[in-house]
């Protein structure tokens, strides 16, 4: 039978390549049984994770899983870094793996796009 503990399904060592100026939604997949836990986002600064208090967040509910979303509108160059979501559940703190955002500043983007950029943004080949 399925565990009724809260589980946060951010993949270990996951990464996202994003462009400054674009909107972006960072998802924290959350599994819970009865009551939706209180979830927060933080940004890693060395070994400490600084809570993101004043950022826009929202929930997206799907059939078997929910997503706690951190909104970047737009992405800024200093959004580069590693993020983690945490859930408070029955006075336990559950922490996700961290996920890393690699922000490319359009103004300083190198002339040669990466393989990932070419796959997700074929128009980069023709700029």
């Amino acid at each position: 039978k399925e565990s009724c503990d809260v589980q946060l399904y951010i993949k270990r060592q996951s990464e996202h390549s994003i462009l400054a100026g674009d909107p972006f939604e960072l998802e924290c997949p959350v599994k819970y049984c009865a009551n939706r836990p209180h979830v927060t986002w933080c940004k890693l600064n060395g070994t400490t994770c600084v809570k993101l208090e004043d950022r826009q967040t929202s929930w997206k509910e799907e059939k078997n899983i929910s997503f706690f979303i951190l909104h970047f509108e737009p992405v800024l160059p200093n959004d580069n870094g590693s993020y983690r979501c945490s859930a408070n559940f029955q006075s336990n703190l559950i922490e996700s793996h961290s996920t890393t955002l690699y922000v490319t500043d359009v103004k300083s983007a190198s002339e040669r796009p990466s393989k990932d950029e070419m796959a997700s943004r074929p128009w980069l080949l023709y700029r």
């Epitope: 399904y9 993949k11 270990r12 060592q13 990464e15 996202h16 070994t47 793996h97 990932d116 997700s120």
Partner: antibody, heavy 121, light 112 residues
Framework: EVQLQQSGAELVRPGASVKLSCTAS????????VHWLKQRPDQGLEWIGR????????KYDPKFQDKATITADTSSNTAYLQLSSLTSEDTAVYFC??????????????WGQGTSVTVSS | DVVMTQTPLTLSVTIGQPASISCKSS???????????LNWLLQRPGQSPKRLIY???KLDSGVPDRFTGSGSGTDFTLKISRVEAEDVGVYYC?????????FGGGTKLEIK
């Protein structure tokens, strides 16, 4: 049941390219990582790279960066490995492997049966 | 790259006797989440590799308890308490924390 079904053996000419496929069943590749590994005849295992099919983000061993391109199609639950400018050094068996799984222990747990690539003129 | 050094290269063991394989990494495999990402797999002749042990000591489902994994940091060991005929093949350790992922050179277990 979790399975990774790889495409059939390939015999290719030097200088050509080849694209291998790895179709998953029993799980959604979007939820996990897919890795590709190389094993030359009677040799050890070499890690080529991995893809996060949820966002297409890849990581490669630098020595395969210009040789290999890993992609994924979540609609068909399939990952691909394209090898370019083939030489005899690329003659090997290539394995796709899942990393992730239901308990998220992050150790490659399910392996495809391997695809043999022979480069010969 | 993290170098994974496996010894011995070949292990010739009588059925029923114990066997031990060492794996040393050039960097610590302890991650910030407190887990150590050292894994062992077995490749039987003519087959794909199969996961045997993950996170140093956790046995994959279906793996008999005569196998044990131990170690920490950079020094790890796989032990088989009583070797059986089905244990023949090549054993690899590999690390799952640093990129690129790297493997030991393999230890071939054969029956004496």
């Amino acid at each position: 049941e979790v399975q990774l079904q790889q495409s059939g053996a390939e015999l290719v000419r030097p200088g050509a390219s080849v694209k291998l496929s790895c179709t998953a069943s029993g799980f959604n590749i979007r939820d996990d990582y897919v890795h590709w590994l190389k094993q030359r005849p009677d040799q050890g295992l070499e890690w080529i790279g991995r893809i996060d099919p949820a966002n297409g983000k890849t990581k490669y061993d630098p020595k395969f960066q210009d040789k290999a391109t890993i992609t994924a199609d979540t609609s068909s639950n399939t990952a691909y490995l394209q090898l370019s400018s083939l030489t005899s050094e690329d003659t090997a068996v290539y394995f796709c492997v899942r990393e992730g799984g239901s308990n998220y222990d992050y150790a490659m747990d399910y392996w495809g049966q391997g695809t043999s690539v022979t480069v010969s003129s | 790259d993290v170098v994974m050094t496996q010894t011995p290269l070949t292990l010739s063991v009588t059925i029923g006797q114990p066997a031990s394989i060492s794996c040393k990494s050039s960097l610590s495999l302890l991650d910030s989440d407190g887990k150590t990402y050292l894994n062992w797999l077995l490749q039987r002749p003519g087959q794909s590799p199969k996961r045997l042990i993950y996170l140093v000591s956790k046995l994959d489902s279906g793996v008999p308890d005569r196998f044990t994994g131990s170690g920490s940091g950079t020094d790890f060991t796989l032990k088989i308490s009583r070797v059986e005929a089905e244990d023949v093949g090549v054993y690899y350790c590999w690390q799952g924390i640093h990129f690129p992922r790297t493997f030991g050179g393999g230890t071939k277990l054969e029956i004496k």
